[in-house]
Interface confidence: medium
């Protein structure tokens, strides 16, 4: 393990269409990778008139957008599909929209998905 | 380093069956997921079917379903694609392709296919 | 299904050109894009995936940007090993769909 590096070795499972895809609903995904490559967990939701909507969560391959996350927190003003990643062990339980972009006091919106 | 060998390609007739294999080594195989993709000739890419790393899901492209099984024996460190009831439209390489996570980020390593050719 | 749109299918470029090959998603698709090189008789090879991370070893010409439903695969300067076919993948919901590809040839 590198020195001040979250390791990143299981992740909070979900996909909401399970079915369609042909997956495990919910559960905790083991990650795996190449050796020198870093891991990481992600969110992807959706917002419907107020209403969060949990659409995946799991691990995620080495990206350096989600390089020293400890939190899943999006940033992008207003997406249709909000994404997150983070590193640590389920770092991705939890998951924040905290748009960069605003003018105004960004306020947190901090999601614990709810088992279904 | 991660290797996927196709095999079991070949001219059959319309109506008539293959299975394919896909030996693995390199890698802890019953961790991936693992997938088919064909490429009809002078064509692209067409995602066949896949399934999960302890063969407990498998999904199939509409054009296949009912007609295609994907399975695996993990104590082989082999994937399967049996095609039955083949048309000329199969004609097609089939590659085998590595899933990257259980819900497929990207298809991170492929075999270098093997030809189905459904002709009379 | 997601239909997955590129422009252009074919273009021509020379030694040290800046390409740029853009795939459309018909619904967000959030990070969940990747490109493949494809060189006659060969497998596909992974290039880059989650829209902007290069697969091992690629070289550091190749870049992707994007988010939603629009995308775009950049080569800062095209080399004769780019001369290939490049398709465009999304894996946010099955089936796995690609785009058409784009042939990049020698002008």
């Known amino acids: 393990a590198i020195l001040g590096r979250s390791e990143t070795q299981e992740c909070l499972f979900f996909n909401a269409n399970w079915e369609r895809d042909r997956t495990n609903q919910t559960g905790v995904e083991p990650c795996y990778g190449d050796k020198d490559k870093r891991r990481h967990c992600f969110a992807t939701w959706k917002n419907i008139s107020g209403s969060i909507e949990i659409v995946k969560q799991g691990c995620w391959l080495d990206d350096i957008n989600c390089y020293d996350r400890t939190d899943c927190i999006e940033k992008k003003d207003s997406p249709e599909v909000y994404f997150c990643c983070c590193e640590g062990n389920m770092c991705n339980e939890k998951f924040s929209y905290f748009p960069e972009m605003e003018v105004t006091q960004p306020t947190s919106n901090p999601v614990t998905p709810k088992p279904p | 380093e991660v290797q996927l060998l196709e095999s079991g390609g070949g001219l059959v007739q319309p109506g008539g069956s293959l299975r394919l294999s896909c030996a693995a080594s390199g890698f802890t195989f019953d961790s991936y997921s693992m997938n088919w993709v064909r490429q009809a000739p002078g064509k692209g890419l067409e995602w066949v079917s896949n399934?999960?790393?302890?063969?407990?899901?498998?999904g199939y492209a509409d054009s296949v379903k009912g007609r295609f099984t994907i399975s695996r024996d993990n104590s082989k460190n082999t994937l399967y694609l049996q095609m039955n009831s083949l048309r000329a439209e199969d004609t097609a390489v089939y590659y085998c392709a590595r899933g990257a996570n259980w819900h497929d980020t990207a298809l991170d390593y492929w075999g270098q296919g093997t030809l189905v050719t459904v002709s009379s | 299904d997601i239909q997955m749109t590129q422009s252009p299918s074919s273009l021509s470029a020379s030694v040290g050109d800046r390409v740029t090959i853009t795939c459309r998603a018909s619904?967000?698709?959030?990070?969940?894009l990747n490109w493949y090189q494809q060189k006659p008789g060969k497998a596909p090879k992974l290039l880059i995936y989650?829209?902007?991370s290069l697969a091992s070893g690629v070289p550091s010409r190749f870049s992707g940007s994007g988010s939603g439903t629009d995308f775009t695969l950049t080569i800062s300067s095209l080399q004769p090993e780019d001369f290939a076919t490049y398709y465009c993948q999304q894996s946010y919901e099955s089936p796995l769909t690609f785009g058409g590809g784009t042939k990049v040839e020698i002008k």
């Open positions: 399934i999960n790393y302890n063969g407990g899901y498998t």
């Open positions: 619904q967000s698709i959030s990070r969940y």
């Open positions: 989650a829209v902007t």
